[in-house]
């Protein structure tokens, strides 16, 4: 089952798959210029069975003279972040990759891939926290969060890590900023079917869609 | 017949970002026809190669809301229009009501 | 382009009944493959993806099979409630394409 939300958003912190489990989806994104292949992938799935995991579905992108893209997301330069993962500014392996069955690794880079990598966790995945330069940590428990089910829905858990800069006092728990709890977040329930006609955020949140037409125009 | 239509597709309840956004129509007493895809994250498109050129699929993430615009309307685009969260491998979980498009003279 | 081929088009069931819809892709997909109910003016709804998995909510008398090239929608026991149009959609590359239907009618 996907995790519906994102992990926790830790202040100055990023956060790093070190493996990902079997299940999980990556977008096949392009960089600027290039899009993917007719009839190619939009995305690669960690798959495999008992003794071996892998990538399955290859992306590839492909020049292309036009681009019908909205919104296009410029990434910081000489920076290589991921949504739902973020690389991490200093190596961290509390994991050998190698010795988790049922994982694949980080997928090797392809040609004209985006700056950004967009994964889709499954329950069960692990992301480790860090704080990013310049910052450092007041662990009050592991510094990870995992995707677990509860009562039909998915939700993080919260990261145990405060980070601090290195020239402020240091923040004791008592006065810490409050962390908005995995508990306290709109979650998605995606057993609920659509509802088309109220679209007002529910105490149980549906997703939902609703469609209408916008304008017509007459040539 | 020639003129555009644009359908808009509001989403709630879920990251609008996290998913990319299917639109599939269906003509009366046909089946399902995939149009396109568009990542709600940064608007990369796949279009179904007989519309390429004549839709347009945009997203606004402010307001977790997609647009499929199709141009130059000819009778056979009379179709019952679709959106859909699409979770790729898991499946077009969440659908829309559906918007009727008639296309006559 | 991959094609999907739905059969049969059309069966004609009773309340009770087993049922069994089959679908075909023109090369292997794997297990990316997903299948919907559609009901009269309704939209449609996931049942199940990823050729076995059922869908939250969905009853458990609906199960799904195969891979590769074969895949199969099975209902265990037909329910008033089950009569409707049933698709098969591959997931594995685009243009993602849909089967052609297959509609359940009472006999």
């Known amino acids: 089952e996907l995790c519906d939300d994102d992990p926790p958003e830790i202040p100055h912190a990023t956060f790093k798959a070190m493996a990902y489990k079997e299940g999980t989806m990556l977008n096949c994104e392009c960089k600027r210029g290039f899009r993917r292949i007719k009839s190619g992938s939009l995305y690669m799935l960690c798959t495999g069975n008992s003794s071996h995991s892998s990538w399955d579905n290859q992306c590839q992108c492909t020049s292309s003279a036009t681009r019908n893209t909205t919104k296009q997301v410029t990434p910081q330069p000489e920076e290589q972040k991921e949504r739902k993962t973020t690389e991490m500014q200093s190596p961290m392996q509390p994991v050998d990759q190698a010795s988790l069955p049922g994982h694949c690794r980080e997928p090797p880079p392809w040609e004209n891939e985006a700056t950004e990598r967009i994964y889709h966790f499954v329950v069960g995945q692990m992301v480790y926290y860090q704080c990013v330069q310049g910052y450092r940590a007041l662990h009050r428990g592991p510094a990870e969060s995992v995707c677990k089910m509860t009562h039909g829905k998915t939700r993080w858990t919260q990261p145990q890590l405060i980070c601090t800069g290195e020239m402020e006092t240091s923040q004791f728990p008592g006065e810490e900023k409050p962390q908005a709890s995995p508990e306290g977040r709109p979650e998605s329930e995606t057993s609920c079917l659509v509802t088309t006609t109220d679209f007002q955020i529910q105490t149980e949140m549906a997703a939902t869609m609703e469609t209408s037409i916008f304008t017509t125009e007459y040539q | 017949p020639g003129a555009s239509v644009k359908v808009s597709c509001k989403a709630s309840?879920?990251?609008?970002?996290?998913?990319?956004i299917s639109w599939v129509r269906q003509a009366p007493g046909q089946g399902l026809e995939w149009m396109g895809w568009i990542s709600a994250y940064n608007g990369n498109t796949n279009y179904a190669q007989k519309l390429q050129g004549r839709v347009t699929m945009t997203t606004d993430t402010s307001t977790s809301t997609a647009y499929m615009e199709l141009r130059s309307l000819r009778s056979d685009d009379t179709a019952v229009y679709y959106c859909?969260?699409?979770?790729?491998?898991?499946?077009?979980?969440?659908w829309g009501q559906g918007t009727t498009v008639t296309v006559s003279s | 382009d991959i094609q999907m081929t739905q059969s049969p088009s059309s069966l004609s069931a009773s309340v009770g009944d087993r049922v069994t819809i089959t679908c075909r892709a023109s090369?292997?997909?794997?297990?990316?493959l997903n299948w919907y109910q559609q009901k009269p003016g309704k939209d449609p709804k996931l049942l199940i993806y990823a050729a076995s998995s059922l869908q939250s909510g969905v009853p458990s008398r609906f199960s799904g099979s195969g891979s590769g090239t074969d895949f199969t929608l099975t209902i265990s026991s037909l329910q008033p409630e089950d009569f409707a149009t049933y698709y098969c959609?591959?997931?594995?590359?685009?243009?993602?394409?849909f089967g052609g239907g297959t509609k359940v009618e009472i006999k």
């Open positions: 959609q591959q997931s594995h590359s685009t243009p993602l394409t």
């Open positions: 859909a969260r699409d979770r790729g491998y898991y499946g077009m979980d969440v």
């Open positions: 090369q292997s997909i794997s297990r990316y």
């Open positions: 309840g879920y990251t609008f970002t996290s998913y990319g």
